[in-house]
């Protein structure tokens, strides 16, 4: 249902926001162990004025890389809801501006984590740091769009 504007963002608030908040809540412990280094994705893809749809389109695509990364089914379900829901709502709002499909790689760190952890642990932590930031940015960007639709 394309009622993101007509009902003050009810689709976002009742589906996407709930899933984003559930995911972020389950990742509360992640953050203190994350390095300060900026991920390449966030250097290149920013939720700037008139580019919100472009950012969210790529962010949703990036989210799909994290499906099955986590062991719990609930986590995957919420990821899927956010990824698919974002893509659907972008089409509703006319915000989407896609590009050629990409071969999905994994989130790349800009620097390696402390050397005393195994590479596998490093990578998993790094991926979770990236995922948490991605979800936070998606939430912020949707809120920016909704503020705009309520103002006009």
């Amino acid at each position: 249902d394309c009622d993101i504007e007509g009902k003050d963002g009810k689709q976002y608030e009742s589906v996407l926001m709930v899933s984003i908040d559930q995911l972020l809540d389950s990742m509360k412990e992640i953050g203190s162990n994350c390095l300060n280094n900026e991920f390449n994705f966030f250097k290149r893809h920013i939720c700037d004025a008139n580019k919100e749809g472009m950012f969210l389109f790529r962010a949703a695509r990036k989210l799909r890389q994290f499906l099955k990364m986590n062991s719990t089914g609930d986590f995957d379900l919420h990821l899927l809801k956010v990824s698919e829901g974002t893509t659907i709502l972008l089409n509703c709002t006319g915000q989407v501006k896609g590009r050629k499909p990409a071969a999905l790689g994994e989130a790349q760190p800009t620097k390696s984590l402390e050397e005393n952890k195994s590479l596998k642990e490093q990578k998993k932590l790094n991926d979770l740091c990236f995922l948490k930031r991605l979800l936070q940015e998606i939430k912020t960007c949707w809120n920016k769009i909704l503020m705009g639709t309520k103002e006009h």
Epitope: N36, N37, E38, K43, H45, I46, L104
Partner: antibody, heavy 117, light 111 residues
């Protein structure tokens, strides 16, 4: 509207230091990456460094030993500390706000640094 | 470092002409479905101005006569019908890899 205003340029002797400032307004300063780019007289553009929202930095390797980028979010100001200046550092120095695709979406008017004895 | 080679370095054209500027990267600037090339216009004594980002996206407020295309290593900036205010120097820039690098510029002059 987005505004970036550089200051701190001028004539300096070789081997000396200089700190450039870039005062920003019209956007949420702490939410954006920022860059320094320079242009020697009659020449092309050269990227120097970037600083990201969390404070991490990227440098052009040619300048990492002499130049330091920093930001003060409470003052909405970006800085470039330049040490051991050489004649070839003579240029107009621009600050720029990061844009989509790591482009330079907004630029200051530039500040001229002349290194001469 | 990724080298960006622009051609021609200068060109003369008349108002109304279609102008094409090319930019060649020393290696691919594509990643995850996007081409990380941006185009700028610079007039004498002024700061550069962003025209095109991520190869083909027109920056807000830039006239539709400007367009960008290409992928991999070969990119093009096209001005469909040159206007008097378009006489300037144009630069391409890659952002796929640090250090961010620019082409040498293309000066568009009046014929």
């Amino acid at each position: 509207q987005v505004q970036l205003v550089e200051s701190g340029g001028g004539v300096v002797q070789p081997g000396r230091s200089l700190r450039l400032s870039c005062a920003a307004s019209g956007f949420t300063f702490s939410s954006y990456g920022l860059h320094w780019v320079r242009q020697a007289p009659g020449k092309g553009l050269e990227w120097l460094a970037a600083i990201w929202t969390g404070g991490s930095t990227d440098y052009n390797a040619a300048f990492i030993s002499r130049f330091t980028i920093s930001r003060d979010n409470s003052k909405n100001t970006l800085y470039l500390q330049m040490n051991s200046l050489r004649a070839e550092d003579t240029a107009v120095y621009y600050c720029a706000r990061n844009g989509y695709g790591e482009s330079f979406a907004y630029w200051g008017q530039g500040t001229l640094v002349t290194v001469s004895s | 470092d990724i080298q960006m080679t622009q051609s021609p370095s200068s060109l003369s054209a008349s108002v109304g002409d279609r102008v094409t500027i090319t930019c060649k990267a020393s290696q691919s600037v594509d990643d995850d479905g996007d081409s990380f090339i941006n185009w700028y216009q610079q007039k004498p004594g002024k700061a550069p101005k962003l025209l095109i980002y991520v190869a083909s996206n027109l920056e807000s407020g830039v006239p539709a006569r400007f367009s960008g295309s290409g992928s991999g290593t070969d990119f093009t900036l096209t001005i469909s019908s040159l206007q008097p205010e378009d006489f300037a120097t144009y630069y391409c820039q890659q952002s796929n890899e640090d250090p961010l690098t620019f082409g040498g510029g293309t000066k568009v002059e009046i014929k």
